[in-house]
């Protein structure tokens, strides 16, 4: 039969510039001599010869003189290959081919890696920064392999996925330099962190920059928003109220107004230097231009969707700046529940029935309550599931298993906890007349 050749299942990971051992072994029979051994290492894809041992002699490296066997260990079945000063170009699959009387082969993968340098951060512009300014932060990390994954986050660790452009360029050695650019609208102050991850080494290199914009000696702008969340029905328009107190002689040319998502800092809408810069949020936002001069910085959000739910920051900068966050709570009423009964015929007292209560397209998740005809809660055998559709609206299905009495009414109440809206349905079951003894 064939000779069994063993190699590691997992790729061998080697750092650029270091030496790597590609393990390969076989089981020599008693009385085995090296004169009988033919050992060939080759590149799996191209069949290019890497190293060989034949007729009792090491035939040497055919691979840039950077390979070696372990001659003292060959007789014990160790056919491993030492690859020196690993390069990116070495990455790939190597086949270890052993022939004595029979032959066998197996392939081992070499995964090359190089750690990325600690990122350097540059900020443009880097002086005279004001709230509302757009800045470009560049994060550069060098000489890594393979291509990096780059993540940006703010000082609270919230991912910044918005305006990011990442480019990776390989040098002559195949090592990558990564440059990632984040464009962000400045708030009152902020820390921006860049993390460069080597996916093979699971090595993270990170740096951060903290930006504190210039403040005016004349003091901050007071920005007012409602304390309670604004509740908006899906598909309707919502107004996120925000106001400031303009000073005498205030002109809109001095105003920087920015609405952004509080967590991700994604720009929603802006007004700068006397002009409405328009919606950066799916063209569904608008200001109240005629009211801005009076200090009304409110935002109109049209055709509200579930995905809009969350916190929006209203950021006002005149000479100085102020900001406040307003929460949008999205809601959608649940439909009147439909009730189904299984089985639904030939019912007898003592039968177990399944009653399903279904209500559709509500938000947020519902609370479901079951009760009998006397209003007594039924908490026993109830299973409720809620599934969101593509729009994020929930369909709720609640199943009650109950043993029939003589007759009974079963009510299901679906409550929207935000709208405090109750939708209910009920079913009345009248069993067959009872006979004694009950028929089997």
């Amino acid at each position: 039969g064939a000779l069994e050749v063993q190699v590691p299942e997992d790729p061998v990971v080697a750092l650029v510039g270091t030496d790597a051992t590609l393990c390969c072994s076989f089981s020599p029979e008693p009385g085995f001599s090296l004169a009988q051994l033919n050992l060939i290492w080759q590149l799996t894809d191209t069949k290019q010869l890497v190293h060989s041992f034949a007729e009792g002699q090491d035939q040497g490296s055919a691979y840039a003189n950077r390979t070696a066997l372990f001659p003292d260990l060959l007789a014990q079945g160790n056919a491993s290959l030492r690859l020196q000063r690993v390069r990116v170009a070495d990455e790939g699959s190597f086949t270890c081919f052993v022939s004595i009387r029979d032959f066998g082969s197996a392939a081992v993968s070499l995964q090359v890696a190089a750690p990325y340098s600690k990122p350097s951060m540059t900020l443009e512009p880097n002086k005279d920064l004001r709230p509302g300014d757009t800045v470009t932060i560049t994060c550069s990390s060098y000489q890594g392999y393979p291509e990096a994954e780059v993540f940006w986050q703010d000082g609270q660790g919230v991912p910044l996925t918005g305006n990011v452009t990442t480019s990776q360029m390989a040098n002559e050695q195949g090592l990558f330099d990564v440059h990632s650019i984040l464009r962000v609208v400045l708030g009152a102050n902020g820390t921006y962190s860049c993390l460069v991850r080597n996916p093979v080494l699971q090595q993270d290199a990170h740096s951060s920059v903290t930006i504190t914009p210039q403040r005016s000696p004349t003091g901050a702008v007071e920005v007012q928003v409602p304390e309670d969340p604004v509740v908006a029905l899906v598909g309707t328009d919502a107004t996120l109220r925000c106001s400031f107190s303009p000073e005498p002689g205030f002109s809109l040319a001095q105003l920087n107004l920015i609405w952004q998502l509080t967590d991700t800092k994604q720009l929603v809408h802006s007004f700068t230097e006397g002009r409405d810069q328009g919606s950066a949020y799916a063209n569904r936002t608008a200001l109240f231009p005629d009211l801005l001069a009076q200090g009304n910085a409110s935002l109109r959000l049209q055709r509200v969707r579930v995905a809009d739910e969350g916190s929006f920051t209203c950021f006002v900068s005149i000479r100085d700046f102020g900001s406040a966050a307003v929460s949008l709570q999205v809601a959608a009423p649940y439909s009147k529940p439909s009730m189904t009964l299984e089985p639904n015929k030939d019912l007898r007292p003592g039968d177990t029935v399944t009653i399903t209560c279904s209500s559709y397209r509500g938000y947020p998740e519902a609370e479901v309550f079951w009760q009998d005809g006397q209003g007594v809660p039924l908490t026993g055998n109830v299973t409720t599931s809620q599934m969101a559709n593509e729009q994020g609206l929930f369909d709720v299905h609640s199943v009650l298993r109950v043993v029939l009495g003589a007759n009974g009414t079963y009510s299901c109440l679906v409550r929207n906890p935000v709208l405090q809206q109750d939708a209910h349905g009920s079913v009345t079951i009248t069993g067959q007349p009872m006979t004694f003894p009950p028929e089997a």
Partner: antibody, heavy 116, light 107 residues
Framework: EVQLVQSGAEVKKPGSSVKVSCKAS????????MNWVRQAPGQGLEWIGR????????RYNQNFRDRATLTVDKSTSTAYMELSSLRSEDTAVYYC?????????WGQGTTVTVSS | DIQMTQSPSSLSASVGDRVTIRCRTS??????LAWYQQKPGKSPKLLIY???TLEEGVPSRFRGSGSGTDFTLTISSLQPEDFATYFC?????????FGGGTKVEIK
């Protein structure tokens, strides 16, 4: 090293147009607004307008809104200022300068002479 | 538009003199004022921004002060390389506007 290199001097007839270029290097072109400022012989400085290279958003001085057009070519990091319907009083040195509030780097200037 | 009035329009001074140039604005611009120096045949060069912040590489003999509507550029001890024209510029509003300039000449 930050550099703004402008195109060469131009001589134009009244009623014609001129297009001046400003090639930026040594910084991220899309990170800074590019301003255009002119200076008539022996006179002060007059702001024409500015453009944000990232998305080509522009702001103009009302005095130039109808005649000046600011554009950029991001692929070559070059900003352009075109002035149409030229008259003799448009004879000036035209500068590009980067920044929003502070103009920290300026081009070397392009002399535009309008003469019949 | 915000009007910028610079005074004097020219002055003569000697090396080592203390020189003061004033700039007045038609409305309150808080502290958003910059000063530029221009030599004949050259582009303007930023000296001071935010009324009193010295640009990198600018000698400390240049000093800016003021806020609101009245601003001053002071050169504590005039050097030969300081003979030039100086402009103020407001960055509070669009359009950006410049003062008419002050030419500092050798006495």
């Amino acid at each position: 090293e930050v550099q703004l290199v402008q195109s060469g001097a131009e001589v134009k007839k009244p009623g014609s147009s001129v297009k001046v270029s400003c090639k930026a290097s040594g910084y991220t072109f899309t990170a800074y607004w590019m301003n255009w400022v002119r200076q008539a012989p022996g006179q002060g400085l007059e702001w024409i307008g500015r453009i944000e290279p990232y998305d080509s958003e522009t702001r103009y001085n009302q005095n130039f809104r109808d005649r000046a057009t600011l554009t950029v070519d991001k692929s070559t990091s070059t900003a352009y200022m075109e002035l149409s319907s030229l008259r003799s009083e448009d004879t000036a040195v035209y500068y590009c300068a980067r920044g929003v509030r502070i103009f920290d780097y300026w081009g070397q200037g392009t002399t535009v002479t309008v003469s019949s | 538009d915000i009007q910028m009035t610079q005074s004097p329009s020219s002055l003569s001074a000697s090396v080592g003199d203390r020189v003061t140039i004033r700039c007045r604005t038609s409305e309150n611009i808080d502290y958003t004022l910059a000063w530029y120096q221009q030599k004949p045949g050259k582009s303007p060069k930023l000296l001071i921004y935010n009324a009193n912040t010295l640009e990198e590489g600018v000698p400390s003999r240049f000093r800016g002060s003021g806020s609101g509507t009245d601003f001053t550029l002071t050169i504590s001890s005039l050097q030969p390389e300081d003979f030039a024209t100086y402009f103020c510029k407001q960055a509070y509003d669009v359009p950006r506007t410049f003062g008419g300039g002050t030419k500092v000449e050798i006495k």
